[in-house]
């Protein structure tokens, strides 16, 4: 089936926005006013995955860019990266596992768990201007809770 997608922005629970930091990295920082235009707009696609009544599998692409967040092992550690894809073939309903995140909604907050690496989550640091990364702990120093803002197409 044609994949269903929506455009959105994400902010962590401390209200930090996500912006590009170089060609293949995202960072989280507080933005205000006109600077809000810097935040990345995601194209969130609803894909096949190990869906449950609590988890919805999604892929997170950057709107109008052929870049997707993906999870891979680097030096034996699950790592978040921005991966370039062929725009003719993506997005698709049957995304490879490294591109899939389980979107989990708890108390109006969202978590994004890697399908490839269960219990590893899209995370931000408490500190300003630090890279968005894949973290293996929840409820610690690092932030794994996000809110989603819909963006009209």
């Amino acid at each position: 089936a044609p994949v269903r997608s929506l455009n959105c922005t994400l902010r962590d629970s401390q209200q930090k926005s996500l912006v590009m930091s170089g060609p293949y990295e995202l960072k989280a920082l507080h933005l205000q006013g006109q600077d809000m235009e810097q935040q990345v707009v995601f194209s969130m696609s609803f894909v096949q995955g190990e869906e449950s009544n609590d988890k919805i599998p999604v892929a997170l692409g950057l709107k109008e860019k052929n870049l997707y967040l993906s999870c891979v092992l680097k030096d034996d550690k699950p790592t978040l990266q921005l991966e370039s894809v062929d725009p003719k073939n993506y997005p698709k309903k049957k995304m490879e596992k490294r591109f899939v995140f389980n979107k989990i909604e708890i108390n109006n907050k969202l978590e994004f768990e890697s399908a490839q690496f269960p219990n590893w989550y899209i995370s931000t640091s408490q500190a300003e201007n630090m890279p968005v990364f894949l973290g293996g702990t929840k409820g610690g120093q690092d932030i794994t809770d996000f809110t989603m803002q819909f963006v009209s197409s």
Epitope: A1, Q48, E50, K93, K94
Partner: antibody
């Protein structure tokens, strides 16, 4: 060789709960999901829900409040529990293995057990 | 939820005849349709998996076609051993949904 076998009580009294065990061999429950399906006498197939390799579950909405699926990976067993049974829950209950091929056919089912017949009657 | 409408409900065919069963889905499911055969007292057996792929060991007289919302299952030359119930299953999205089934009998 993939094999699934259901074992259940046969007869259940109305308003009581049903417990069925699916014992599998030839594949690991950590790698593949298992679905439950039922078939009332002379009728068609109804998909009840599934448990994935990682342990997450998905229940079909009409039965969600009455269903529970869990598993024991080390014993290669999947358990279906259904509460508050009524006569229209009389059916053959099947477990089936998910194909679980990422990026290809995640939701399809290939191998089925023989089924266990459950009659709800006082 | 994707609804699957299967037709006909029953078929009476002579040996050697061509059998055609159709399933229509309420949403576009690409090629994610599966076809099962069920004989009395037995569990369903997967004949054709998504992508119109014949399963290993299944005779070549069985085939299917279709994508999107319209799917057809064909038995090219019916044999007596093909008497059974046949079901389609969409595996595009959860919850998985079956067609109501087609009872194939011998004329």
């Amino acid at each position: 060789q993939v094999h699934l076998k259901e074992s259940g009580p046969g007869l259940v009294a109305p308003s009581q709960s049903l417990s069925i065990t699916c014992t599998v061999s030839g594949f690991s429950l950590t790698d593949y999901g298992v679905s439950w399906i039922r078939q009332p006498p002379g009728k068609g197939l109804e998909w009840l829900g599934l448990i994935w390799g990682g342990g997450d579950t998905y229940y079909n909405s009409p039965l969600k409040s009455r269903l529970s699926i869990r598993k024991d990976n080390s014993k290669s067993q999947v358990f279906l529990k259904m509460n508050s049974l009524q006569t229209d829950d009389t059916a053959v209950y099947y477990c089936a293995k998910q194909r679980t091929l990422w990026g290809y056919d995640l939701y399809g089912m290939d191998y089925w057990g023989q089924g266990t017949s459950v009659t709800v009657s006082s | 939820e994707t609804t699957v409408t299967q037709s006909p409900a029953s078929l009476s065919m002579a040996i050697g005849e061509k059998v055609t069963i159709r399933c229509i889905t309420s949403t576009d499911i690409d090629v994610d349709m599966n076809w099962y055969q069920q004989k009395p007292g037995e569990p369903p057996k997967l004949l054709i998996s998504q992508g119109n792929t014949l399963r290993p060991g299944v005779p070549s007289r069985f085939s299917s076609s279709g994508s999107g919302t319209d799917f057809v299952f064909i038995i090219e030359n019916m044999l007596s051993e093909d008497v059974a119930d046949y079901y389609c299953l969409q595996s595009d999205n959860l919850p998985l949904t079956f067609g109501a089934g087609t009872k194939l009998e011998l004329k």
